[in-house]
């Protein structure tokens, strides 16, 4: 099917920037990694390079404004020709649940005392209101609450007093036309305006102002402008050579609005002065390779030593990574494929350990699924022997950092009856669903 | 190890109606993505349906669209295919199978591809005749 092709996807936003056209295949667009795609207008957009999982989006809003609950964020995978983690298609959202609260407590309702007395009237002739209020204090709301209905009301009050009504213009009438759209007629242009007394007029029992100033106001009518000539769009030039040496770009037509030139304010050319056409070199683009992630460490030895695990001998291990997804005379990745790092070993050492505190309350599991629940830990740490952290392995090499490696066999004394991991679970409040929030804006 | 049973195949005429059942042994069932595959002899194996979670969305192939609904009952560890208005060109065995990844995802791509399902039932056939 053909897509929209775009020269550029936003990382930030997700994107696609830099419309280039349609009508083209994905294979065609995705010539070169750099470009990005999408399948209808306004959908969602792809970029080019091999699939992955784009940022966390930000928590979505607490499923509940007061008290305990969830709130949901995801992620996508994102790119084209490939997968994420393995055997996620892109456009594929990931879900993560977790508990929430805004506000403690939920806001209570307090109740009214008695109204006070009136106010005197807002005016000394013709008709007014009066106002009275009341509290509320009776009881006094709690957490942000509020009492329902007015803490004020008003109703009519008359003086049995005439009042007086001065006089006010109402707003100027529109210019009258000028007698010619064009300068260098045989009469002198001119215009003008009106406005009455009549917002309001002034009364006669009693006697109002009259309104200040004059009624009528002429000028004369300046800066007209020669008649307007129309202008009009000479031929198309040349079509520019495609400007790129791989994938799709774009070549462009000029045109000049000179056939005539607009003169005396007269309208410019209708329409656009270039088109664009793509075009396709159908040559692939180079795509740089990219690290992998770094892998394991390698166990943690020492050259003709059987084992040096808890012992107080520094070894040596490695661990290694892989340039992927060079192709097209793409660049190399950059920097180590080998990292090496001295060590000593703890590989299955038994170990003194102590209780960590309680860790942060994790994720809610399943986040999407039936019952939720979040959980947090107290593990047996142990207590890493007291090895020099430095050593000069080699003359004049100076001193290097030690690790230790490995996974020691802690020994605690019981908690709860547990001996390496003691868990608390709790089940997640007012789940929200998890919805395709690019589903949504259809 | 966990085991997908389906059941609730057979013979039918067109315009007519199935309920296929998958029954899954294993207690974390509830938190498998459950899909539903067909193959019809000489083709390649085509997605049907998916029903991810209790609580997600649910995706149906444009063809099956409107006439096939998937459900599941977790108490019963239990994914259902109610197949109505057949049609001769529905008729395939019929695959039950889970994704027990850890991932909790939705997205068409996602479930449309076999990839992401780890455990398969052993097949139920579906016959439509004209």
């Known amino acids: 099917d053909p897509v929209l092709c775009f020269t550029q996807y936003e990382e930030s936003s997700g994107k696609c920037k830099g419309l280039l056209g349609g009508g083209v295949s994905v294979e065609d667009c995705c010539l070169n990694t750099a470009f990005a795609y999408q399948k209808r207008s306004g959908g969602l957009c792809q970029p080019c390079r091999s699939p992955r999982w784009s940022l966390w989006s930000t928590w979505a809003p607490c499923s509940v404004t007061c008290s305990e609950g969830s709130q949901l964020r995801y992620r996508r995978c994102v790119g084209w020709n490939g997968q994420c983690s393995g055997k996620v298609a892109p456009g594929t959202l990931e879900w993560q649940l977790q508990a929430c609260e805004d506000q403690q407590c939920c806001p209570e309702m307090g109740g009214w005392s008695g109204w006070g007395p009136w106010e005197p009237c807002s005016v000394t002739c013709s008709k007014g209101t009066r106002t009275r209020r009341r509290a509320c204090n009776h009881p006094a709301p709690k957490c942000g609450g509020h009492c329902p209905g007015q803490a004020q009301e008003s109703e009519a009050c008359d003086t049995q007093q005439v009042c007086p009504t001065h006089g006010a213009w109402a707003t100027w009438g529109p210019w009258t036309p000028c007698s010619a759209s064009c300068h260098g007629g045989p009469h002198e242009p001119k215009e003008t305006r009106s406005r009455k007394c009549s917002a309001p007029e002034p009364s006669q029992k009693p006697p109002g102002k009259p309104c200040p100033g004059l009624a009528y106001e002429q000028r004369r009518c300046t800066g007209l402008p020669p008649c307007p000539v129309a202008g009009g769009w000479g031929p198309w030039g040349p079509v520019s050579p495609c400007p790129v040496t791989c994938g799709l770009g774009q070549t462009m037509e000029q045109r000049t609005c000179n056939h005539p030139v607009p003169q005396h304010g007269g309208p410019f050319c209708a329409g656009d002065a270039t088109r664009t056409h793509i075009c396709n070199t159908a040559v692939p683009c180079p795509v740089d390779g990219e690290w992998d992630s770094w892998g394991e460490w390698s166990p943690c030895i020492r050259r003709n030593m059987k084992s040096i695990s808890c012992q107080e001998i520094p070894g040596q291990q490695s661990r290694g990574r892989t340039c992927r997804g060079r192709k097209f005379d793409g660049h190399r990745c950059a920097g180590q494929q080998q990292d090496i790092r001295h060590c000593y070993s703890i590989q299955h050492c038994p170990l003194k350990g102590s209780w960590s505190e309680w860790s942060t309350w994790g994720l809610c599991m399943p986040p999407c699924g039936p019952n939720p629940t979040r959980a947090r830990q107290r593990l047996c740490t142990p207590l890493l022997p007291k090895y020099p952290p430095t050593v000069s392995m080699v003359e004049g090499q100076g001193e290097k950092n030690v690790t230790f490696w490995g996974r020691p066999l802690p020994r605690c004394e019981e908690l709860q009856g547990q001996k390496l991991v003691v868990e608390e679970k709790r089940p997640c409040l007012h789940v929200p669903a998890c919805k395709d929030p690019e589903e949504e804006e259809l | 190890q966990v085991q997908l049973v389906e059941s609730g195949g057979g013979l039918v005429q067109a315009g007519g109606s199935l309920r296929l059942s998958c029954a899954a042994s294993g207690r974390t069932f509830s938190s498998y993505a459950m899909g539903w595959f067909r193959q019809a002899p000489g083709k390649e194996r085509e997605f049907v349906a998916a029903?991810?979670?209790?609580?997600?969305?649910?995706y149906y192939a444009d063809s099956v669209k409107g006439r096939f609904t998937i459900s599941r009952d977790d108490a019963k560890n239990t994914v259902y295919l109610q197949m109505n208005n057949l049609k001769p060109e529905d008729t395939a065995v019929y695959y039950c199978a889970a994704d027990s990844s850890a991932g909790y995802y939705s997205g068409f791509d996602y479930y449309s591809a076999a990839t992401p399902y780890d455990l398969w039932g052993q097949g139920t056939q579906v016959t439509v005749s004209g």
């Open positions: 029903v991810p979670w209790t609580y997600g969305s649910k």
